[in-house]
């Protein structure tokens, strides 16, 4: 039960995280105009990974795409690449994790296969989250560097009479969305990896068989002295699979291994 919950929660958290990474990548507000030195500006500038926008106080917003590829800063290209890699890995991870979910039945898929898929998706989510966090952090670092560079030569002018205010940019909403989304994807991935441990059956060199005497139903396990007295409907011989971390009531509820997914 705890495994299913952990896996399900990991999936949901990762799903939210990847949706957030996609949203952040598409958002125009990666950097927004710093209004500290000019809070009365009627024109507001903001930039994304794909285009830059200007919102006039009339409400008129004009956005221009970066139609050049070679003319863009290498750092911006790197951020784009990291975010796209994060999205692709996250999307594949989501696809894999859907089939790995314990609550979904797909033919007669073994627990071990589900465990492997869960681990794979978990690793993908972790890498996806790290890509997003790295991408956002690289962009943030770029902003900080440019901010202080533009602060150093903020005002230029003719004899101090005319001021030319250089537009400075600060952290936009997309950065915070990206950090949070990357973090969620990372957490979701870790949860999937934890769930994988609970799904993976332990390696056993034997098949446990229960032998039932006519009177007291006693289960004898080769190589072990642990016996359990059985009462109730457990009259027919059946294989007991001891592998895997599962509770006693789970064993009773799901007696056949083919009932597991």
């Amino acid at each position: 039960m705890a495994v299913t919950a952990c896996q399900g929660l990991g999936f949901v958290v990762s799903l939210i995280g990847i949706a957030g990474i996609i949203a952040a990548t598409c958002m125009d507000q990666w950097s927004t105009q710093d209004l500290y030195n000019n809070p009365v500006t009627a024109v507001f500038n903001y930039q994304g990974l794909w285009r830059s926008c200007v919102r006039e106080s009339s409400g008129f917003t004009e956005c221009r795409g970066y139609f050049t590829l070679l003319g863009l800063p290498a750092m911006l290209q790197a951020v784009r690449a990291l975010m796209i890699v994060g999205i692709v890995l996250g999307a594949i991870g989501l696809l894999v994790s859907i089939f790995a979910l314990k609550c979904i039945r797909i033919g007669s898929m073994e627990d071990s296969a589900k465990a492997n898929m869960t681990l794979t998706s978990g690793i993908m989510f972790i890498v996806s989250g790290l890509c997003a966090i790295a991408g956002v952090s690289v962009f943030a670092n770029m902003l900080v560097t440019n901010f202080w560079m533009s602060t150093a030569n903020m005002y230029t002018g003719m004899g101090g009479m005319v001021q030319t205010v250089q537009t400075r940019y600060t952290f936009g909403a997309a950065l915070f969305v990206g950090w949070v989304a990357g973090g969620l994807t990372l957490i979701g991935g870790v949860m999937m990896c934890i769930a994988c441990r609970g799904l993976a059956p332990e390696e056993t060199n034997y098949k446990a068989v229960s032998y039932h005497a006519s009177g007291h139903s006693v289960a004898y396990k080769p190589g072990g002295f642990k016996a359990s007295t059985g009462f109730g409907s457990n009259t027919k011989n059946k294989k007991i699979y001891d592998g895997g971390a599962r509770t006693e009531d789970e064993v009773q509820s799901y007696p056949s291994k083919h009932d597991y997914v």
Partner: antibody
Framework: QVQLQQPGSELVKPGASVKLSCKAS????????MHWVKQRPGQGLEWIGM????????NYNEKFKSKATLTVDKSSSTAYMQLSSLTSEDSAVYYC????????????WGQGTTLTVSS | DIVMTQSPSSLSVTAGEKVTMSCKSS????????????LTWYQQKPGQPPKLLIY???TRESGVPDRFTGSGSGTDFTLTISSVQAEDLAVYYC?????????FGSGTKLEIK
Amino acid sequence: QVQLQQPGSELVKPGASVKLSCKASGYTFTSYWMHWVKQRPGQGLEWIGMIHPNSGSTNYNEKFKSKATLTVDKSSSTAYMQLSSLTSEDSAVYYCARRYYGSISPDYWGQGTTLTVSS
Amino acid sequence: DIVMTQSPSSLSVTAGEKVTMSCKSSQSLLNSGNQKNYLTWYQQKPGQPPKLLIYWASTRESGVPDRFTGSGSGTDFTLTISSVQAEDLAVYYCQNDYSYPFTFGSGTKLEIK
């Protein structure tokens, strides 16, 4: 077509208050900022402030913040500017102007209300 | 506040002449985000409200004759009337559209001889 109707004139006593109106027609009133501009006789233009009819959001020239209050009545598509504690310095022509959407310049202006403050 | 300085304060020309008037701002009106200059030119004829002529320093408002041309960038702007007509008798104002409060120049009065 777009029209901004303003009363031709208002005569008020010093110390009193007045509420100037600007009735808009021919466009979606709530989509455009409404500006108010002051022009004293034989003088230049002074921007008082602006209001967005949809949100009621305002932006004032600091100089007029304690003098003017901008409001709107969406149901009648009318913008108002209340001027308080009137003095002879407030005697002027007051224009309302609609914000041009492709730029931040007003493109439609009312004919203006001539406010006379006299005892 | 941005101070707008217009010169000359008045001009007297004959019909058909070319006219140039200047407007200087105390701070740059050039927005780096879109490389547009947020300066507007208005024409105000006697007894009438101002009329928008040019916005973004050089973009003519629809319906404005092409004899009106706006130019300049940063802090120095110019309005040129290539061939003055009798109906151009008016006061011409430049306005800062970049920063609150929106400020106007004192105006250039154009008179026809």
